[in-house]
């Protein structure tokens, strides 16, 4: 799935429009596909293709549907109970639920290593040392370079997910 949920990504708290379905909360909670009204008396349905909720909740809002970033393909559309599912395009990857954008898979393994895993939408190619069989993943550091990890750039202007 793609795109980060930020404070701006929540569907605004709003009174139910006449066409929005209402039902009563169960044990104070509303089912997936709904959020609770401000007075707590009603469950208001999320709007198909616009926002969603995945779990029983007493939230005053539904979460806004993700729009897939460029470099991603839409696997399934947003429904009232499930967010859009986006996947990195062929030749790129992002670890599942990582906040990073899709990154290009490496084209080959460093010297002395052999490829044992292909590029997938959620993982880079996997390399192991020829002799020891130990795994190597991530960028290939220059000789003597210290390897540190740093967070990736967040997805573009925070289109929303859940």
């Amino acid at each position: 799935e793609s795109a980060l949920i930020t404070q701006q990504d929540l569907a605004p708290q709003q009174r139910a429009a006449p066409q929005q379905k209402r039902s009563s909360p169960s044990e104070g909670l509303c089912p997936p596909g709904h959020h609770i009204s401000e007075d707590g008396r009603d469950c208001i349905s999320c709007k198909y293709g616009q926002d969603y909720s995945t779990h029983w909740n007493d939230l005053l809002f539904c979460l806004r549907c993700t729009r897939c970033d460029s470099g991603e393909v839409e696997l399934s559309p947003c429904t009232t109970t499930r967010n859009t599912v986006c996947q990195c395009e062929e030749g790129t990857f992002r670890e599942e639920d990582s906040p990073e954008m899709c990154r290009k898979c490496r084209t080959g393994c460093p010297r002395g290593m052999v490829k044992v895993g292909d590029c997938t939408p959620w993982s880079d190619i996997e390399c192991v040392h020829k002799e020891s069989g130990t795994k190597h993943s991530g960028e290939v550091p220059a000789v003597e370079e210290t390897v540190t990890s740093s967070p990736g750039t967040p997805a573009s202007p925070c289109s929303l997910s859940g």
């Epitope: 980060l4 929540l10 995945t54 007493d58 939230l59 990582s98 859940g162």
Partner: nanobody, 124 residues
Framework: EVQLVQSGGGLVQAGDSLRLSCAAS????????MAWFRQAPGKEREFVTY????????AYADSVKGRFTMSRDNAKNTVYLQMNNLKTEDTAVYYC?????????????????WGQGTQVTVSS
């Protein structure tokens, strides 16, 4: 990044109640996504509940719906998990988590700050 320190937990009987606390420090929590997860021995870390620091309400996993409640105390910068009518299957290490932005709110991978974990054991 936010630092999270948990307290509460322990050994209780089935049907009892327990409250876990998660105190945050390091920065203001305005707009932060907060969640509780749990991990039973030999199992994956699973979603329990989720909310946003400065907005009312929470979302709950089916397994805890109607028994667990998430709340916040702004003055104490603390998030609580009130657990009622505990069952033996609630036995796990419970973790609170926080992030300024999340990709999938019910996935542990979406959170960058974690509490140290609190053991909850429910005996029959």
């Amino acid at each position: 990044e936010v630092q999270l320190v948990q307290s509460g937990g322990g050994l209780v009987q089935a049907g009892d109640s327990l409250r876990l606390s998660c105190a945050a420090s390091g920065r203001a929590l305005t707009g932060y996504h907060m969640a509780w997860f749990r991990q039973a021995p030999g199992k994956e870390r699973e979603f329990v509940t989720y909310g946003i620091w400065d907005r009312a309400g929470a979302a709950y996993a089916d397994s805890v719906k109607g028994r667990f409640t998430m709340s916040r105390d702004n003055a104490k910068n603390t998030v609580y998990l009130q657990m009622n009518n505990l069952k033996t299957e609630d036995t796990a290490v419970y973790y609170c988590a926080a992030s300024m932005a999340v990709r999938t709110y019910y996935s542990p991978r979406s959170y960058d700050s974690w509490g140290q974990g609190t053991q909850v054991t429910v005996s029959s």
